[in-house]
């Protein structure tokens, strides 16, 4: 098939590649209990039907059991992502065990060949899980697999084989290519584990998706709409390299599924939160940011289990890097009307003000136009906590929609030079936090004046008239 | 206790090739990759590329493209490195170097070097 | 590839001195930085892994610091056997790269 055009065709060609791989016979998969967060540490082997390397390397029967399934391979080493997700479970569980399942002879090969390779270390997974089975005080239930791109797929198959019902599979940016639309037993489902969590962060509707788009979890959780991530612009990249590639992009974006997983677990004061909605398109209109009736839920390691019959879609914007917590709020803007404003879009930037913090100046995204005599919803975030919001600053920009709308404009100018200021015409402000499902309604500080100009600044305040709208139900997910 | 040990110095001719040996005692040769680092008189060390004994796939650095060919042996717990198509610029002491799992884990044992003399 | 830069390119110093060497990255090596000792003729000897953890067998009066770009390796108090060439290497991207080298001679 032909290679698709655009910044994935590079890795797009790293998929056909011939490979010349060295390697007279596929051995079989090995389990690496990590006994240590160190990298120089050289773990312990474990070994199907032999006991005695449980007892030596200090196997816990009691305790979580991890096993890091890693995915495709370039080098025929482990990336540094493996590292420092060893590290955080280490970290938060203790006492957990966690394994290193290295399939490198299957997964260093051609994408293809790694692809059609992940049943069968699936299959092995699951031997090893059955085996460990027959020991006293082991439970499934207890196993969490986590398999970042490729190796979410062999999590699923490893869910699949195995006898009994794994506790819960985390699948990170589970790969795309091969698995889109693929049948429910060829690819990671909410069949495969009891609780199936997915972070979705490479996926594209154009070119190559490297992470799949579809939903394959309980609950699939796409950050920043699971396809740009912050911080992993060409911009970024190229800017903190000597040397930046586009597959450093990708390598970004992919493995920013690990990294927000590695937060959840080291960051555990800073949870992030994702929000039910039905597409990317709605989120960032500020529309889906409700937590009732299990509509949010903590990302990462510290999501609460919710099997839900349906899949779940779920959204949430982050920094750029770790904490990657934000905090969400829905702005409801009501504009009265418009004046003289010909076919010019505006866009508008608040400023929040609150007890612990002010926020920088934040542009209202537009996903459809704005309505005159209607509430526009928008979203808004801001990457510290602002505490109780007291005050709003909003201005406003005619921003061209077209080169034709830009000429109209200005035609339309040349021949009125006098033409009257164009203005909006807004009262009120309601706003939603998404951390703490606060709702407040700002109004403006001078009832009279209520009109804004391009460029103009129009306050806001904590309505006089009470600032809760209405109460809701307390949210499911213990916000903080 | 873990041992690298390299095969003796060699002089080659332009244009030839050289097979230098590393074996590795004191550990279980598949559970670490090995690694070969050059070092030219007088300069600083260069990576050359590593091999997973374990199954054989190997990684080489662009800068050596297809000159550098890395194998093992399992069964006497050896890894090899052939360089061909040498230049005067290839002279160098090249060491093998163990390391771990991850692409952080340091080069913690080395093998004493093997001197690589290119001349006509 | 990961460029890495160190400082300075030699220096003397004596028994007993503090002594600190610096190693620059091109770019954020999340810690993943080791350093080396090799005495003429020899092989290198890793001293500091992952920043700042000290190789077995390794004297305490080695010690490591530093992160995102820019490290340090010092030594507390020269002994004799320190005098030697000084490396650092990054373990964060493929392919690994090493300092230019910093060699540390007897005043």
């Known amino acids: 098939s032909p290679t698709p055009f655009g910044p994935e065709g590079q890795l797009a060609d790293e998929l056909h590649k011939p490979k010349a791989i060295q390697t007279e016979v596929k051995p079989s998969v090995r389990f690496n209990l990590r006994t240590s967060k160190d990298p120089e540490h050289e773990g312990c082997y474990l070994s199907l039907g032999h006991s005695q390397p449980l007892e030596d390397c200090g196997f816990n029967m009691t305790a979580k059991t991890f096993f890091i399934i890693h995915g495709w391979t370039m080098s025929g080493i482990f990336e540094n992502w493996l590292h420092k997700l060893v590290s955080a479970l280490h970290t938060r569980e203790k006492d957990a065990n966690v394994v290193v399942v290295d399939w490198l002879p299957l997964a260093h090969q051609l994408y293809t060949d790694a692809v059609n390779n992940t049943r069968v270390v699936g299959h092995s997974i699951a031997r090893m899980l059955d085996w460990l089975q027959e020991k006293d005080d082991f439970s499934l239930g207890n196993v969490h697999l986590i398999g970042y791109s490729l190796g979410a797929h062999v999590a699923g198959y490893a869910g699949n084989f195995v006898k009994g019902t794994v506790g819960r599979i985390t699948g990170l940016d589970p790969a795309g290519p091969m698995f889109e639309g693929a049948d429910i037993h060829k690819r990671l489902s909410p069949d495969d584990a009891d609780f199936v969590d997915v972070l979705h962060t490479y996926t594209r509707s154009f070119g190559l998706s490297i992470g799949i788009q579809m939903p394959v979890g309980h609950i699939d959780i796409y950050p920043n709409g699971g396809d740009f991530q912050p911080g992993c612009g060409l911009n970024d990249v190229l800017g903190s390299m000597a040397y930046g590639t586009i597959t450093e992009v990708v390598k970004c974006e992919h493995e920013r599924a690990v990294h927000l997983f590695v937060d959840s677990l080291v960051n555990q004061d800073k949870p992030s939160f994702a929000f039910q909605c039905t597409d990317s398109n709605r989120f960032k209109k500020g529309i889906c940011l409700s937590c009732r009736k299990n509509r949010c839920n903590s990302i990462g390691y510290n999501a609460k289990k919710m099997r839900n019959k349906r899949n779940s879609k779920m959204y949430l914007k982050t920094r750029a890097g770790m904490p990657f917590r934000v905090y969400h709020y829905q702005m409801k803007i009501h504009v009265f009307s418009y004046k003289n404003m010909g076919e010019i879009e505006p866009t508008f930037y608040v400023t929040l003000y609150g007890t612990n913090a002010d926020s920088q100046t934040l542009p209202l995204e537009i996903v459809e136009r704005i309505e005159q005599n209607a509430t526009n919803t928008f979203l808004v975030y801001t990457e510290e906590d602002l505490g109780d919001l007291l005050k709003i600053q909003l201005t406003w920009e005619g921003a061209s929609q077209s080169w034709y709308n830009l000429w109209k404009e200005l035609r339309s100018y040349l021949s009125q030079p006098h033409n009257p200021g164009r203005e909006l015409n807004i009262r009120r402000i309601r706003v939603k936090s998404g951390e703490t499902q606060r709702k407040l309604t700002f109004c403006a500080e001078d009832p009279e004046n209520t009109s804004i100009s391009p460029g103009r600044e129009l306050w806001f305040r904590k309505c006089r008239d009470g600032w809760r709208m209405k109460n809701e139900t307390s949210p499911t997910v213990e916000l903080p | 206790q873990v041992q690298l040990v390299q095969s003796g110095a060699e002089v080659k001719k332009p244009g030839a090739s050289v097979k230098v040996s590393c074996k590795a005692s004191g550990y279980t040769f598949t559970d670490n990759t090995i690694h070969w680092v050059r070092q030219a008189p007088g300069q600083g060390l260069e990576w050359m590329g590593h091999?997973?004994?374990?199954?054989?796939?190997?990684n080489n650095n662009e800068k050596f493209k297809d000159r550098v060919t890395m194998t093992r042996d399992t069964s006497i717990s050896t890894a090899y490195m052939e360089l061909s198509r040498l230049r005067s610029d290839d002279t160098a002491v090249y060491y093998c170097a163990r390391k771990g799992i991850y692409y952080s884990s340091p080069f913690d044992y080395w093998g004493q070097g093997t001197t690589v003399t290119v001349s006509s | 590839d990961i460029q890495m830069t160190q400082s300075p390119s030699s220096l003397s110093a004596s028994v007993g001195d503090r002594v600190t060497i610096t190693c620059r990255a091109s770019?954020?090596?999340?810690?993943?930085l080791n350093w080396y000792q090799q005495k003429p003729g020899k092989a290198p000897k890793l001293l500091i892994y992952y920043t700042s953890k000290l190789h077995s067998g390794v004297p305490s009066r080695f010690s490591g610091s530093g992160s995102g770009t820019d490290f340090t390796l010092t030594i507390s108090s020269l002994q004799p056997e320190d005098f030697a060439t000084y490396y650092c290497q990054q373990g964060n991207t493929l392919p690994f790269t090493f300092g230019q080298g910093t060699k540390l001679e007897i005043k």
């Open positions: 770019q954020d090596i999340n810690n993943y």
């Open positions: 091999i997973n004994p374990y199954y054989g796939g190997t």
